[in-house]
Amino acid sequence: RGVFRRDAHKSEVAHRFKDLGEENFKALVLIAFAQYLQQCPFEDHVKLVNEVTEFAKTCVADESAENCDKSLHTLFGDKLCTVATLRETYGEMADCCAKQEPERNECFLQHKDDNPNLPRLVRPEVDVMCTAFHDNEETFLKKYLYEIARRHPYFYAPELLFFAKRYKAAFTECCQAADKAACLLPKLDELRDEGKASSAKQRLKCASLQKFGERAFKAWAVARLSQRFPKAEFAEVSKLVTDLTKVHTECCHGDLLECADDRADLAKYICENQDSISSKLKECCEKPLLEKSHCIAEVENDEMPADLPSLAADFVESKDVCKNYAEAKDVFLGMFLYEYARRHPDYSVVLLLRLAKTYETTLEKCCAAADPHECYAKVFDEFKPLVEEPQNLIKQNCELFEQLGEYKFQNALLVRYTKKVPQVSTPTLVEVSRNLGKVGSKCCKHPEAKRMPCAEDYLSVVLNQLCVLHEKTPVSDRVTKCCTESLVNRRPCFSALEVDETYVPKEFNAETFTFHADICTLSEKERQIKKQTALVELVKHKPKATKEQLKAVMDDFAAFVEKCCKADDKETCFAEEGKKLVAASQAALGL
């Protein structure tokens, strides 16, 4: 059976149940429902999932049974629309239920909320978690899927199954350990951090597909897979790109059963043909399915083939460039991107896509000119500034990071981005700038050849977080412009923004800068966030404040918190010293 070329099935739900098995089927349906109805209680979702599963089993027994021929969207949509409190809980999303498929599913997709109003997940005591795990392992793991899926409505579903498997393994091992906390907490921290990163990466893939179309996603995939599999033929890369695009289109479209099934098929195909794809796949291909798919997705770049010919000969010097381009534009551009990317694992994917776009624009112009060859002869010279811009930016920022350390580097970015786009909400500016700042510890440790792909492609993921959060409640034309004009130029667009001179400073509000003794019991991370929130508010009040002024105020603030947290009567200290600090800060900033 060719990958994705399936026989027609009388019952799609039976087909997927059989392919995936009951456990994965139930988990994926739960994820799908939680990603659509993000506010519904856990118990309601479990009930819906059980009903769908029982129905699927009747279809497995008899594919001709009533309703078994219905599409998955119809079955799942009908089930979601039975929720009694739909109108009260979700407001206008309830209107989706008046629509027919496929419009109904599109409507549900449009109502996915990247920043749902849900309480922060608080981690219970280790003993409490271990008891819950032992009492009802199945419910405990379902709850994990539910809580992650509803907070991350675009989380890559088959990958969430992999996270859940690791979550289960952590509890299985650590709840028997002598020091449960020492065993479990680092594992949970790692899963949390990896999960957030995975969610953000997938969110960019979905944004790419949904906002910029399949061609944009395919171009990204050609570049990335060509870097990763430089020994593979162009046709092999093209086939993988086509299949990968189908998988991500399905997952981003809420077709999670099809997505998981097709991802498994793709992993199988890659492993069966690894000799033609990459020498680095051997270990991945020996693992069980979920680990295998994850491992393939993260596999290191294969070595570049020796003696690759110069690109200039066929893409610039040849007199046949326009003829070859005209024959099949996207294939020719795809080959250019493939050939360039496999030679440049040291470039970010977004840089490679900028180069390909420049090449395409040049051919469009030159192939209509009187002397095409003369016109496009210098096209590679146009690449130089495009390559140097991210190189210089990364060099400067890594130097700054090494000089300041992560926290102060984040603060520098907080100030920089608040001045660029002060209309953006303070929590979003704090979250995004903190994540932008993490590029330092993540990428600056790498040698030159790995810095750019690490840094710029990571920044694309973080800036997409800003774009999706801003899209929900747009407040800045500059953010909208950078987010919507070009996917690959988002980072250069934001980098190029200067201080927003049109911004009217925020009114001073002493309450914003009033702190209480509860800050003393916060974790170091939470305390940093409090201070960074104050810093953003300070810049919003005084956008023209100098670095020196802001540093002085922040240093005073840190000293104030440290002093009051050591005081016997903390609350009184915060009240009295806080007033003095606010007055001194106002004076220092001329507020």
């Epitope: 162009f234 092999e236 093209s238 033609s276 083939p305 010919p309 066929d314 070859n324």
Partner: nanobody, 125 residues
Framework: EVQLLESGGGLVQPGGSLRLSCAAS????????MGWFRQAPGKEREGVSS????????FYTNSVKGRFTISRDNSKNTLYLQMNSLQPEDTAVYYC??????????????????WGQGTLVTVSS
């Protein structure tokens, strides 16, 4: 439509060399991925080497790496296969094939659209 015509086959002693040629005519875009395949008696047709006429990238099956070299002359629309250190197991009919670069995969002959008649290479003492 595309026509492919191989030449250069023959009898050679083990350790010897041969150079195969393949002249292509017709729509050259349809031949922008070209390859050499071989079929020994009683065996399936297998990919030997392929080249993109745009970009110039080359690919070889493991058993011929370091011994065979594929090349092309775009101005003459001709594909070559330089075969050195020939062994008796290299004996086969060698076919020239062509197709679209977005489809052609060396391990899968069905992804090539156009084929020559073949030229016999015999390695024997």
């Amino acid at each position: 439509e595309v026509q492919l015509l191989e030449s250069g086959g023959g009898l050679v002693q083990p350790g010897g060399s041969l150079r195969l040629s393949c002249a292509a005519s017709g729509n050259t875009y349809l031949t922008s991925c070209m390859g050499w395949f071989r079929q020994a008696p009683g065996k399936e047709r297998e990919g030997v080497s392929s080249i993109y006429t745009v970009g110039g990238s080359t690919f070889y099956t493991n058993s011929v790496k370091g011994r065979f070299t594929i090349s092309r002359d775009n101005s003459k629309n001709t594909l070559y296969l330089q075969m050195n250190s020939l062994q008796p197991e290299d004996t086969a009919v060698y076919y020239c094939a062509a197709g679209s670069p977005a489809r052609c995969r060396l391990r899968d002959p069905t992804t090539f659209d156009y084929w020559g008649q073949g030229t016999l290479v015999t390695v024997s003492s």
